[in-house]
C-alpha cells in the first residue's frame, strides 16, 4: 500500500467546538461508509440509490465531490454535514432525488469549501429561510457557494404551506447578503409564476441565470441592470407574452449576456412592436429564429422576426387564459 | 499556454541523491494537487509521489518510501522531488504531472491531465 | 495493492481496423479508470477517465466502457496517429497503479 506521510484526515481540528451533530469519531483516511463508494484518489464519494435515511456520519475527511442522489433523506437537520474535523474540501455536494422536504437553519454550516450544491428533484415544501445562511443575522457571513441547482424543488399541491413557493426560496436566496458571490443559480422546472423584484439585485455576481419551464407571465417588474456579469439568462418555456422597452433596454445593456426565450406563447399585437424592432437589431437573444406567435388565432405561428408594424394591430378581445395579467 | 517542464535529471551513482525540479507557468499552481510518475527504459508508467496544493498531504509508492520526498513551493510555481539513496532501478524518466484536481474544481476527476516532457535520471556505478 | 493487468501486451492492425484493449483490476474499483496513450519519446495523454468518459479534445473513435473489474478501452477505426502504447490506471485507491500497457503496432 501507499504511505500517506500526512494523512489525508489530518485537518487541523482547531475550528471552533461544533454543535451536536458533529461525528465523535474522526474518520480514518481510507474509510468508506457503509453503502458508499469512495475514491480518495478521485476526492470523491457516491452514495447513490441505496435508500440511506440520514447523511452518512463518517465521511472520509478528504471528500471533494460528495454524491447523496436518490436516497430518502426527508430532512436535512442544522449541521448536516458538519463533523470534527470538518470536511474542510467538501466542494461539491449533490442531493438531488433524494426526496428532501425539510432543508433547516444551518443545514450546510461548517462545509467552508462548498461550492456547487445541488438540491433539485427535492419537493422541498420547507426550505428554511437560513438553510444557506446559517443564522438570522441582517449581514451573514459570506457564502462560499458559486453554483446553487434548484431544478424542480416544487412540491405537490397538497404539500405546499400556506405560503407563497416563490417567496419561500427567495428568502432562502437572500437571507443575510450570505450569496453574494453566487455566480449559478438554476430555479428550472418549479412553478413560478412571478419573480420577487428584489432577489436578482441581490445577487450581482450571477453569471448564469436558469428560469426555464416555470409560468413567469411577465418580467416587468424584474430589474436585470445590476447583474453586469449575467452571461447567460434561460427563459424557455414560460408563460411570456411579450417583452416591454424597460426591459429590452436593460437585457441589451449587459455586455455578455445570451439569452434564450423560445416556447413562450408570445402574443402577437401592437404591443409586440417594440420586440419585434429590438430582436430584428440585438444579437443578444440565441435562436431568435425560432421565437413565433401564439396569440391571436390568426398569427399563430408566424416567426417574430418576419413581422411589420403592419401585422401588429390590437383587436380589443384576448383569450380568456391571457387576461390575468 | 499550460506547461510543465522538468530539470535536474542526470547520471548518478547509486547511494546518492538528486533533486527534480518542475518548473510550472500557466495555470494558477497552488491551486492543484501534483504526481511524479516514472518510467523505467523500455517499461511501463509507475506512479512514485502525491502532493495536495497546500503540500498538507502526501503519498509514496511504497518502492521509494523513506528515500524520495515530494515537496512544493507554491510562491516560486514549483515541484520539487528529492530523491535519496538511489538505486539502479530508480533508473527512469520521471514526469511531474497535475492532477486534474484544483482547489477551486468541484466537477469530476480527470486524472492526471497535463504531463511535462520528462527528466531522465541514470543510476549506474 | 491493487494490481491492474492488461490485455494484450501488444497487437498488430490496419488503418480502419476496430482495436479493442481491455484491462483487469485484481479487485473491485466501481468507474474509477482512466486510460492513457503514450507515443515513443512522449509524456503520457489522457484519454478517458471514469473508465468511460471522453476526455475534452480527444476524438470520439475513442470510448471506454466496464465497471469493477473489467475494462475496455475501444477505438473504432484506428487512425494513423493512433499507434501508440495505451494504458489503463485505476484511482480507486492509492497507491494509483498502471496496467502494463497494450503497443498498437501497424500490422
Known amino acids: 500500500s501507499s504511505s500517506p506521510t500526512s494523512s489525508a484526515s489530518s485537518f487541523s481540528s482547531s475550528a471552533p467546538f461544533l454543535a451536536s451533530a458533529v461525528s465523535a469519531q474522526p474518520p480514518l483516511p481510507d474509510q468508506c461508509p457503509a453503502l458508499c463508494e469512495c475514491s480518495e484518489a478521485a476526492r470523491t464519494v457516491k452514495c447513490v440509490n441505496r435508500n440511506l435515511t440520514e447523511v452518512p456520519t463518517d465521511l472520509p475527511a478528504y471528500v471533494r465531490n460528495l454524491f447523496l442522489t436518490g436516497n430518502q433523506l426527508a430532512v436535512l437537520p442544522a449541521g448536516a454535514f458538519a463533523r470534527r474535523p470538518p470536511l474542510a474540501e467538501l466542494a461539491a455536494l449533490n442531493l438531488s432525488g433524494s426526496r428532501l422536504d425539510e432543508v433547516r437553519a444551518g443545514a450546510f454550516e461548517h462545509l467552508p469549501s462548498l461550492r456547487q450544491l445541488d438540491l433539485s428533484h427535492n419537493p422541498l415544501a420547507d426550505l428554511s429561510p437560513f438553510a444557506f445562511s446559517g443564522s438570522n443575522a441582517s449581514v451573514s457571513a459570506p457564502s462560499p457557494l458559486v453554483e446553487l441547482i434548484l431544478n424542480h424543488i416544487v412540491p405537490p399541491e397538497d404539500e405546499r404551506q400556506n405560503r407563497s413557493f416563490e417567496g419561500m426560496v427567495v428568502a432562502a436566496l437572500l437571507a443575510g447578503r450570505a450569496l453574494q458571490g453566487l455566480r449559478r443559480l438554476e430555479l428550472a422546472s418549479n412553478h413560478f409564476l412571478y419573480l420577487p423584484r428584489d432577489v436578482l439585485a441581490q445577487l450581482p455576481s450571477l453569471r448564469h441565470l436558469d428560469l426555464s419551464n416555470n409560468s413567469l407571465v411577465s418580467l416587468t417588474y424584474v430589474s436585470f441592470r445590476n447583474l453586469t456579469h449575467l452571461e447567460s439568462l434561460h427563459l424557455e418555456d414560460n408563460a411570456l407574452k411579450v417583452l416591454h422597452n424597460g426591459t429590452l433596454a436593460e437585457l441589451q445593456g449587459l455586455p455578455h449576456i445570451r439569452v434564450f426565450l423560445d416556447n413562450n406563447p408570445w402574443v402577437c399585437d401592437c404591443h409586440m412592436a417594440d420586440m419585434v424592432t429590438w430582436l430584428k437589431e440585438t444579437e443578444v437573444v440565441q435562436g431568435k429564429d425560432r421565437l413565433t406567435c401564439a396569440y391571436p388565432e390568426k398569427m399563430r405561428n408566424r416567426v417574430l422576426l418576419e413581422l411589420n408594424s403592419a401585422d401588429l394591430d390590437c383587436d380589443p378581445i384576448l383569450p380568456p387564459s391571457l387576461q390575468t395579467s | 499556454q499550460v506547461q510543465l517542464v522538468e530539470s535536474g535529471g542526470g547520471v548518478v551513482q547509486p547511494g546518492r541523491s538528486l533533486r527534480l525540479s518542475c518548473a510550472v507557468s500557466g495555470f494558477t499552481f497552488s491551486s492543484y494537487d501534483m504526481n511524479w510518475v516514472r518510467q523505467a527504459p523500455g517499461k511501463g508508467l509507475e506512479w512514485v509521489t502525491f502532493i495536495s496544493y497546500d503540500g498538507s498531504n502526501k503519498y509514496n509508492a511504497d518502492s521509494v518510501k523513506g528515500r524520495f520526498t515530494i515537496s512544493r513551493d507554491n510562491s516560486k510555481n514549483t515541484l520539487y522531488l528529492q530523491m535519496n539513496s538511489l538505486r539502479a532501478e530508480d533508473t527512469a524518466v520521471y514526469y511531474c504531472?497535475?492532477?486534474?484536481?484544483?482547489?477551486?474544481?468541484?466537477?469530476?476527476?480527470?486524472?492526471?491531465?497535463?504531463w511535462g516532457q520528462g527528466t531522465t535520471v541514470t543510476v549506474s556505478s | 495493492d491493487i494490481q491492474m493487468t492488461q490485455s494484450p501486451s501488444s497487437l498488430s492492425a490496419s488503418v480502419g481496423d476496430r482495436v479493442t484493449i481491455t484491462c483487469r483490476a485484481s479487485q473491485g474499483i466501481s468507474s474509477w479508470l482512466a486510460w492513457y496513450q503514450q507515443k515513443p519519446e512522449k509524456a503520457p495523454k489522457s484519454l478517458i477517465y471514469a473508465a468511460s468518459s471522453l476526455q475534452s479534445g480527444v476524438p470520439s473513435r475513442f470510448s471506454g466502457s466496464g465497471s469493477g473489474t473489467d475494462f475496455t478501452l475501444t477505438i473504432s477505426s484506428l487512425q494513423p496517429e493512433d499507434f501508440a502504447t495505451y494504458y489503463c490506471?485505476?484511482?480507486?485507491?492509492?497507491?494509483?497503479?498502471f496496467g502494463g500497457g497494450t503497443k498498437v503496432e501497424i500490422k
Open positions: 504531472a497535475r492532477d486534474s484536481y484544483s482547489r477551486s474544481w468541484y466537477g469530476d476527476y480527470y486524472g492526471m491531465d497535463v
Open positions: 490506471q485505476q484511482y480507486n485507491s492509492y497507491p494509483l497503479t
